[in-house]
């Protein structure tokens, strides 16, 4: 009888043992969600701050109207430059009027001087047109000035005032575009 | 981390059609970019088509007015219409995320344009 009875005494104690660490471990699970909440609620809250005080362009773009643009501190090949511009959510600079290349090379004037700078522009090799990166022609009045010698792929690029054509293979500084964000405020 | 499975990949007839699908999971929020790329064998990996974040497509000369590259609405998925395929568009096509770090690749699928 008495041998019954400690053997009740000690499966209790061990149920109280076992209970005890469900306990602990629920109260350390619930620690590690408030902790989370609160991580979560602070990333929230800055995301919307930051992008509350945002302004349209990252910092080193430049605004001008709905786009913002950024010119390179690098040389690369024309590729090479099109995927730079893509890891930042951006493409090539594709320019859609007079008054765009006018603010594009007097930018570059204040900025750096007179470089060459990969625009998204490339010549097709079979046709010869030339054509923007989303497939769209440029306007008559902003097609390269000389056609490149090269037997190689051309793309276009800016220097001065002008749109020019060379290797795509050759290295220069490029433009990455992409759309200004709309303030809500 | 980000994952990429594409799907769409397949035989077909010269000037026919195939779209691909390409499914990004784990930490998108870091994608800026999506891309699909494709290697012929003996050949390079080369840049098919991409968009941006913001919805700006950009492509390869030999695949304008060919193909369409497109998002859903959550920016998860990526789309490669393909049309009027030529045998030259024979190669395993890539998905790629482009972040600001790393760049992550998806696995491949065959595509095969042969009559």
């Known amino acids: 009888k008495l041998l019954q009875v400690s053997t009740i005494a000690m499966q209790q104690q061990e149920k109280l043992i076992q209970q005890e660490r469900a306990l602990l471990n629920f109260t350390e699970w619930k620690r590690s969600c408030a902790l989370q909440m609160k991580y979560c609620q602070a990333f929230m809250q800055n995301s919307l701050s930051s992008a509350h005080n945002s302004s349209p362009c990252p910092n080193n773009w430049i605004q001008n109207r709905e786009s913002c643009y950024y010119v390179s501190e690098i040389w690369s090949i024309w590729h090479t430059s099109q995927e730079n511009c893509l890891k930042e959510g951006s493409t090539l600079l594709q320019i859609e009027s007079k008054e765009e290349m006018d603010f594009i090379t007097g930018s570059l004037r204040k900025i750096k001087g007179s470089y060459d700078y990969w625009v998204g522009l490339s010549q097709d090799g079979h046709s010869g047109r030339w054509l923007w990166q989303d497939g769209s022609s440029p306007s008559p009045g902003l097609l390269p000035a000389e056609r490149s010698q090269s037997a190689n792929q051309v793309c276009g690029y800016v220097k001065s005032n002008s749109l020019l054509s060379s290797n795509c293979s050759t290295w220069k500084y490029f433009i990455c575009e992409k759309y200004a964000l709309r303030s809500s405020v | 981390q980000v994952q990429l499975q594409e799907s769409g990949g397949g035989l077909v007839q010269p000037g026919g059609s195939l779209r691909l699908s390409c499914a990004a999971s784990?930490?998108?929020?870091?994608?800026?970019?999506m891309g699909w790329y494709r290697q012929a064998p003996g050949k390079q990996r080369e840049l098919v088509a991409a968009?941006?974040?913001?919805?700006?497509?950009t492509y390869a000369d030999s695949v304008k007015g060919r193909f369409t590259i497109s998002r859903d609405n959550a920016g998860n998925t990526v789309y490669l219409q393909m049309n009027s395929l030529r045998p030259e568009d024979t190669a395993v096509y890539y998905c790629?995320?482009?972040?600001?770090?790393?760049?992550?690749w998806g696995q491949g699928t065959q595509v095969t344009v042969s009559s």
């Open positions: 790629k995320a482009f972040t600001r770090g790393d760049d992550y």
């Open positions: 968009i941006t974040n913001q919805g700006a497509p």
């Open positions: 784990g930490r998108i929020f870091s994608v800026n970019a």
